[in-house]
Each structure stands twice: as structure tokens, then as C-alpha cells.
């Protein structure tokens, strides 16, 4: 029960996280014009990964895409790449985790397969979250560097008479969305990995028991079921739940320790 809850919660948290990463990547407000200690302008500038926008106090907003690849800063390209990798990994992780959910029955998929899929999706979510956090952090670092550089020469004299105020940019809403979303995806991934441990097949805990039958002796020892035990070609260990309340599915799906031949 706890395993199912952990897995389900991990899935939901990751889903929210990845939705947030997608939202952050698409948002225009990665950097916004710094209004503190600046003359009040009737124009507000903000920039995203894909376009820059200008909002006038009149209400008119104009956005222009970055229609160049080679002309863009390498750091911006790196951030784009990290966010896209994060989204792709997260999307694949979501797809994998849907089939790995314990509450979803797909044919005769075994627990070991579900455990592997849960672990795979968990790792994907972790890497996806890390990509998003890294991307946002690289962009934030770039902003901080540029902010202090433009502060150092904020007022550049023109002929000693006229002054040009340089537009400084500070953290936009997308950065905070990205950090939170990356964190959620990371947490979701960790939860999936924890859930995987609960799903993974384990060695049984009880000691070997001897049963004396008439005429010959059969020792039932923990380990793989052999073909001769009557389970056909299924040579894989099945998880044996000993103790605790079982769901109807568990009772039906898994041989108990008393299912001896």
C-alpha cells in the first residue's frame, strides 16, 4: 500500500514538475527590466529563451523572436538545450512511469518489470529536474554577471552632456517557476526510486522448512522455482509478501509461502 502511494505521489509530483518545466521554457519572463533605482520608464522590457518583449504603458505589447541561431550567446543556447533535454527526459519518464504504476494492470506484467520501469522513470525524472535546475541557474548567473557589469557603467556620458541609461535586467518569473518545477521533478524522481525498492523482487526472509512426505523427503528451500515445481517455464522469483494486509490483487496475483507443491 505504502509502495503504491509513494509511486503514485512520485508520479503526480513529477507530472506537476514537468508541466512547470515546460511552462518555464515557454515563458517570456526569464529576465525583466530592473525598475529599482532606475528612472521610471513608460516602457517595460522582458526577455525569454525564444523572444524578447516590450510592454508600453499604453498597453501595447510587442514581442520579437530571436530569428538567429549563430548570433545568440552560447550561454543562452546552452540553457535552451538543458531545458529541452529536461523536457524530453521528463516526457519519456512520464510515459514509462504510467506503465510502471502498480495501480495499472497491463497484461501479465511482472513486478520485476514494473520495478525496473519505476527505477528508470525515477532516474529520468531526477536527471530532468537537474537539467531544469542547471538551465535556470546558468541563466540566473548570466543575469547577475550582466547586472553588475551594466551597473558599473550604468551611466555612459555622451559628450559630457547627455546621458544614456542602460537597461538592466533582473530575475523574471520564469526562473522561479523553473527552480520550483525542477525541484518537484527531482523530488518526484527520488520518490519513484524509493517506490522501486518496494516493488523489486527480494529473497524471502523465512528459514528453510522440511516437510516429510510418505516415501520420500522434499526440502523446500528459498530460491528460484525450478521447472519441476509445476510453474512451467517461469523460472523467475516472485515477490512474496509475508505479513501485513493484502489487497485482493495481491492475494490473486502472487503465490504465498504456503503455495507449495
Amino acid at each position: 500500500m505504502a509502495v503504491t502511494a509513494c509511486q503514485g505521489l512520485g508520479f503526480v509530483v513529477s507530472l506537476i514538475g514537468i508541466a512547470g518545466i515546460i511552462a518555464a521554457t515557454c515563458m517570456d519572463q526569464w529576465s525583466t527590466q530592473d525598475l529599482y533605482n532606475n528612472p521610471v520608464t513608460a516602457v517595460f522590457n522582458y526577455q525569454g529563451l525564444w523572444r524578447s518583449c516590450v510592454r508600453e504603458s499604453s498597453g501595447f505589447t510587442e514581442c520579437r523572436g530571436y530569428f538567429t541561431l549563430l548570433g545568440l550567446p552560447a550561454m543562452l543556447q546552452a540553457v535552451r538545450a538543458l531545458m529541452i533535454v529536461g523536457i524530453v527526459l521528463g516526457a519519456i519518464g512520464l510515459l514509462v512511469s504510467i506503465f510502471a504504476l502498480k495501480c495499472i494492470r497491463i497484461g501479465s506484467m511482472e513486478d520485476s518489470a514494473k520495478a525496473n520501469m519505476t527505477l528508470t522513470s525515477g532516474i529520468m525524472f531526477i536527471v530532468s529536474g537537474l537539467c531544469a535546475i542547471a538551465g535556470v541557474s546558468v541563466f540566473a548567473n548570466m543575469l547577475v554577471t550582466n547586472f553588475w557589469m551594466s551597473t558599473a557603467n550604468m551611466y555612459t556620458g555622451m559628450g559630457g552632456m547627455v546621458q544614456t541609461v542602460q537597461t538592466r535586467y533582473t530575475f523574471g518569473a520564469a526562473l522561479f517557476v523553473g527552480w520550483v518545477a525542477g525541484g518537484l521533478t527531482l523530488i518526484g524522481g527520488v520518490m519513484m526510486c524509493i517506490a522501486c525498492r518496494g516493488l523489486a523482487p527480494e529473497e524471502t526472509n523465512y528459514k528453510a522448512v522440511s516437510y516429510h512426505a510418505s516415501g520420500h523427503s522434499v526440502a523446500y528451500k528459498p530460491g528460484g522455482f525450478k521447472a519441476s515445481t509445476g510453474f512451467g517455464s517461469n523460472t523467475k522469483n516472485k515477490k512474496i509478501y509475508d505479513g501485513g494486509a493484502r489487497t485482493e490483487d495481491e492475494v490473486q496475483s502472487y503465490p504465498s509461502k504456503h503455495d507449495y507443491v
Epitope: 528612472p39 516602457v43 498597453g59
Partner: antibody, heavy 118, light 113 residues
Framework: EVMLVESGGGLVKPGGSLKLSCAAS????????MSWVRQTPEKRLEGVAT????????YYPDSVKGRFTISRDTAKNSLYLQMSSLRSEDTAVYYC???????????WGQGTSVTVSS | DIVMTQSPSSLTVTAGEKVTMSCKSS????????????LTWYQQKPGQPPKLLIY???TRESGVPDRFTGSGSGTDFTLTISSVQAEDLAVYYC?????????FGAGTKLELK
């Protein structure tokens, strides 16, 4: 057709108050930035108050800050300028304007005259 | 506040003549975000409110004759009337539309010889 009609001007004593109104029609009033601009007897133009689209911000020059208040009633499509502690230098024709592209004042009313004199 | 300086204060011209008037701002009106200059030109005829001619320093308002041309960037701007007509006799104002408070120049009065 865009129409801006000012009213409420008149003669007032120094230190007195006056409220100007501007009835707007023919455009999306609530989504537009609006301004009051005055023209002095010497024909100088001065922006005295601006309210941004969505009413997010109001702006005033230092000469009127604390004395003038711009507001709007979107239900009535009306813009207001509450003027208090009036001085003789506030004597002017007050225009109600709408801001368009480039924050430029693309539509102006005919103006209402305010005279501050004892 | 941004100071807008217009020159000359008045111009006496003959019909058909090319006219140029200048406007200088104390700070750059160029917005780095969209590379547009927030400088506006108005025309005011006697007894009328000002009328918008040009915004973004060079974009003509719809209905404005193409003999009116705005140019310039940063702090120096120019309004040119390629061939003055009798109906162009008015006062021309430039305005800073970038920094609050939005300030106007003192105007250039266009008169007939």
C-alpha cells in the same frame, strides 16, 4: 469614432479644489492608458497625470504630486482628475488624452479651461 | 525630468519650401528592447488641440501626409516637411514618451512669409 469630452473646468480661488471629468467613447477604455495634459497661457504643454492600462500605475510630475489624483470609472467610461491646493500656475487648458502606440497621445479632447485666481 | 529642447522657436517659410526642425532630449529615448526611439511629434493649429503626427520617432500616424518625415535616434531628432503647404502652418511639439513624466518641447512655430 473615438470621442473624448472634458468637463468640470472653471474659475477657482488659490488653495481651492476642482474635479475634471472626461467622458470617453469609441474604444476599449479599460484597456487604454489615459493622460491629462495641460496647456498654459504661454502655450507650453505639460503632462500632469497618467494612468496606465489596467490601472496598474499612476504617474505625476513633481509639480502636481500630492495635489492631483487621476482615476477612472470603467463602468461609466469616465476619466477624472481631482485637483486640490490649486495655485495660480495651475491655470491652463486641460486636455484628456488616450495613449496609443509608442505611448503617443493619439486622441485628444477639446479641452476644459481652469483658471486659478483670487 | 527629461528636458526637450526644440529649435528654432519659429520658422518663416514660403509654400513649397522644404522645412526642417530639431528636437534634442537630455537623455537617450532609444529603448534597447525593441530598438525604437520613444519620441513623438504633434501639430497644433490655433484653437485646436494638438494632433499626433509621428510616433516612434519615424512612424507616421494614419492619415498624416507623407510630406511629413521623422528621423533621428537617441537624443537628436528631426521633423522634415518636404514641401510646406498653407495648412501646415502651426506649432510643432516634440515629446519624450520614454521617461515619466512625459515631457514636451517648447514648440516650433511655422509661419508664412
Amino acid at each position: 469614432e473615438v470621442m473624448l469630452v472634458e468637463s468640470g473646468g472653471g474659475l477657482v480661488k488659490p488653495g481651492g479644489s476642482l474635479k475634471l471629468s472626461c467622458a470617453a467613447s469609441g474604444f476599449s477604455f479599460s484597456n487604454s492608458a489615459m493622460s491629462w495634459v495641460r496647456q498654459t497661457p504661454e502655450k507650453r504643454l505639460e503632462g500632469v497625470a497618467t494612468i496606465s492600462s489596467g490601472d496598474s500605475y499612476t504617474y505625476y510630475p513633481d509639480s502636481v504630486k500630492g495635489r492631483f489624483t487621476i482615476s477612472r470609472d470603467t463602468a461609466k467610461n469616465s476619466l477624472y482628475l481631482q485637483m486640490s491646493s490649486l495655485r495660480s500656475e495651475d491655470t491652463a487648458v486641460y486636455y484628456c488624452t488616450r495613449q496609443g502606440y509608442g505611448n503617443a497621445m493619439d486622441y485628444w479632447g477639446q479641452g476644459t479651461s481652469v483658471t486659478v485666481s483670487s | 525630468d527629461i528636458v526637450m529642447t526644440q529649435s528654432p522657436s519659429s520658422l518663416t517659410v514660403t509654400a513649397g519650401e522644404k522645412v526642417t526642425m530639431s528636437c534634442k532630449s537630455s537623455q537617450s529615448l532609444l529603448n534597447s528592447g525593441n530598438q525604437k526611439n520613444y519620441l513623438t511629434w504633434y501639430q497644433q493649429k490655433p484653437g485646436q488641440p494638438p494632433k499626433l503626427l509621428i510616433y516612434w520617432s519615424s512612424t507616421r500616424e494614419s492619415g498624416v501626409p507623407d510630406r511629413f518625415t521623422g528621423s533621428g535616434s537617441g537624443t537628436d531628432f528631426t521633423l522634415t516637411i518636404s514641401s510646406v503647404q498653407a495648412e501646415d502652418l502651426a506649432v510643432y511639439y516634440c515629446q519624450n514618451d520614454y521617461y515619466y513624466p512625459l515631457t514636451f518641447g517648447a514648440g516650433t512655430k511655422l509661419e508664412l512669409k
